[in-house]
Interface confidence: low
Amino acid sequence: VPGEAEQPAPELVEVEVGSTALLKCGLSQSQGNLSHVDWFSVHKEKRTLIFRVRQGQGQSEPGEYEQRLSLQDRGATLALTQVTPQDERIFLCQGKRPRSQEYRIQLRVYKAPEEPNIQVNPLGIPVNSKEPEEVATCVGRNGYPIPQVIWYKNGRPLKEEKNRVHIQSSQTVESSGLYTLQSILKAQLVKEDKDAQFYCELNYRLPSGNHMKESREVTVPVFYPTEKVWLEVEPVGMLKEGDRVEIRCLADGNPPPHFSISKQNPSTREAEEETTNDNGVLVLEPARKEHSGRYECQGLDLDTMISLLSEPQELLVNYVSDVRVSPAAPERQEGSSLTLTCEAESSQDLEFQWLREETGQVLERGPVLQLHDLKREAGGGYRCVASVPSIPGLNRTQLVNVAIFGPPWMAFKERKVWVKENMVLNLSCEASGHPRPTISWNVNGTASEQDQDPQRVLSTLNVLVTPELLETGVECTASNDLGKNTSILFLELVNLTTLTPDSNTTTGLSTSTASPHTRANSTSTERKLPEPESRG
């Protein structure tokens, strides 16, 4: 348009795609009567009449703007709805009277791009490449105008650097007029970049100002040769027999080499390959002392066929051998003495303890237990515990039974049992002695005998309560080579008229078992209403 270069810069109107642009004709009354205005769009220096205003009434011209234009603000403003990128051009209003005057408006259109989509190079990057390799691609779709992309590594912007960093950006125009930006980051990476976080940022403008959108952070697979191979043992610390032990090979390269684990044969001093699981881990479960020895790992790079050997690692599986006690089955007369000696081997210093089996009481801290002036109560179990104090849980034990010669010895001498007539009673009688006694009953019934330990026996008798049985009572007799002994059970009928639920009797029912070395009569269990000892 002639003389357009001398005209003042057009007024700038900025809108987002899809919104309405308000084009206000800035002619003053002296420049032209706004009741008579023509509106033009200018594209590639070509003017096209798009709207006429006559006496304040508007009329669209046929064409691309026909459906989207309307008058506002008493005819001073032209509203353009559903703005598209193609609308970014100059619009001008021209007043007709008293002489032709123009007012130009530059419409700028903006659209925020979608969130940037970042795709890392899935094939990864070798560190020894001669030129920058593709790290990742960033795509920002449907923005207007073309957004700017900035790449970041570990939160710092990346700049073009000859032979090291190259950013290659291209854009395509969608049918909507919006741009899709694709940016490829190429870089020469080093080993330390294996954990580097890359992301891209799109910078764009809207009428409200400058904005940016960031992609997610990605890491790129970085391939670098192995320089060192080493062994790692789990768990860390002192190992003991029975542990689950894992020996694995590690390398500082990516991808890791092919691993094999070998153990030195203590006889031949040759390295013998061990069988690992699918993950290349040697699992020792349960670990045994034979697993102790010198292990090493070999890493073979299948590309270069270069083999690397780890530093050898000594594995020590700590153990305690079977515990031996001598004498193994001691027998003594009452009043004599006995020395028990405990032996075991271990990879570490051992501590010994002697415990009384029945009570758990510690009798001696050391391998030798001396017992003097033996009484029959001293008969029974003694346990030697050999343990490694520096390794919790590493111990072995051995039980030895001390037998004291003597005639049978009853758990109780006599006992009262409450019964009802015609019920089946379950009676028990216990005796100990060395040699172990046998038990007989003075009444017919079903009797069974159970060996409780080498010196102790328990006999149980099932018998029907009859008047005769009430009359005679029940006796059990224990006998061995050194003598015999008897216990008596008195049977008494439950009398419900005299024993009411409120009566506070303590003569309830008794079981016929007692600890093997308790001389006292058995304890009685308190009951409000006595019941028979056992129902048949």
Epitope: Q148, G155, R156, P157
Partner: antibody
Framework: QVQLVQSGSELKKPGASVKVSCKAS????????INWVRQAPGQGLEWMGW????????DYNEKFKGRAVLSTDTSVSTAYLQISSLKAEDTAVYYC????????WGQGTTVTVSS | DIVITQSPLSLAVSLGERATINCRSS???????????LSWFQQKPGQPPQLLIY???TRASGVPDRFSGSGSGTDFTLTISSLQAEDVAVYYC?????????FGGGTKVEIK
């Protein structure tokens, strides 16, 4: 959430050295810079340098080169500032701050240099 | 070194009124990537500074929208559109375009 926790106050004599620690949590320590900034009593802020824990790379304010050393221990997600040959003018609160944009700060460590 | 000059040194504003702090750089902070590397920090007594604005106009996470940043390559403004009691603090601007990173001398904002 991101947290930077610094070591406690220090009282040092001129000529001595001091080492201030800054323990990070709530984010990937090896992925972001740690900056160090100091503030003398009643004064403004002075940037000392940064370290990138991912590879140990550093950049110092020329004013502190040779006297300040930045380091990290990634196994415990901790950054360190060591200053040697302390002078009375080094009396200040020393801050660590994360990232290129200093988006999170430690609570500060007061270092007093006095004979 | 890039010199950052802040003005005024102190500022007293009534609650609910607008507060404006200026910052001038001895060199353009518009970098060739198209971004302006200027940040604003708020520091309350006995506390570390807190990032308010970075890249001249981008609000940091969790910062109320009454804080805004604007400017050109060398002249910058932090605006608090409606001053609240909790905004009493010293405000610093900072450049990140060139080593050493430098801060302005600070502006103390008080309530009138």
């Amino acid at each position: 959430q991101v947290q930077l926790v610094q070591s406690g106050s220090e009282l040092k004599k001129p000529g001595a050295s001091v080492k201030v620690s800054c323990k990070a949590s709530g984010y990937t320590f090896t992925s972001y810079d740690i900056n160090w900034v100091r503030q003398a009593p009643g004064q403004g802020l002075e940037w000392m340098g940064w370290i990138f824990p991912g590879d140990g790379s550093t950049d110092y304010n020329e004013k502190f080169k040779g006297r300040a050393v930045l380091s990290t221990d990634t196994s415990v997600s901790t950054a360190y500032l060591q200053i040697s040959s302390l002078k009375a003018e080094d009396t200040a609160v020393y801050y660590c701050a994360r990232y290129h944009f200093f988006d999170n700060w430690g609570q500060g460590t007061t270092v007093t240099v006095s004979s | 070194d890039i010199v950052i000059t802040q003005s005024p040194l102190s500022l007293a504003v009534s609650l609910g009124e607008r507060a404006t702090i200026n910052c001038r750089s001895s060199k353009s902070l518009l970098y060739k990537d198209g971004k302006t590397y200027l940040s604003w920090f708020q520091q309350k007594p006995g506390q570390p500074p807190q990032l308010l604005i970075y890249l001249m106009s981008t609000r940091a996470s969790g910062v109320p929208d009454r804080f805004s940043g604007s400017g050109s390559g060398t002249d910058f403004t932090l605006t608090i559109s409606s001053l609240q009691a909790e905004d009493v603090a010293v405000y610093y601007c900072q450049q990140l375009v060139e080593y050493p990173y430098t801060f302005g001398g600070g502006t103390k904002v008080e309530i009138k």
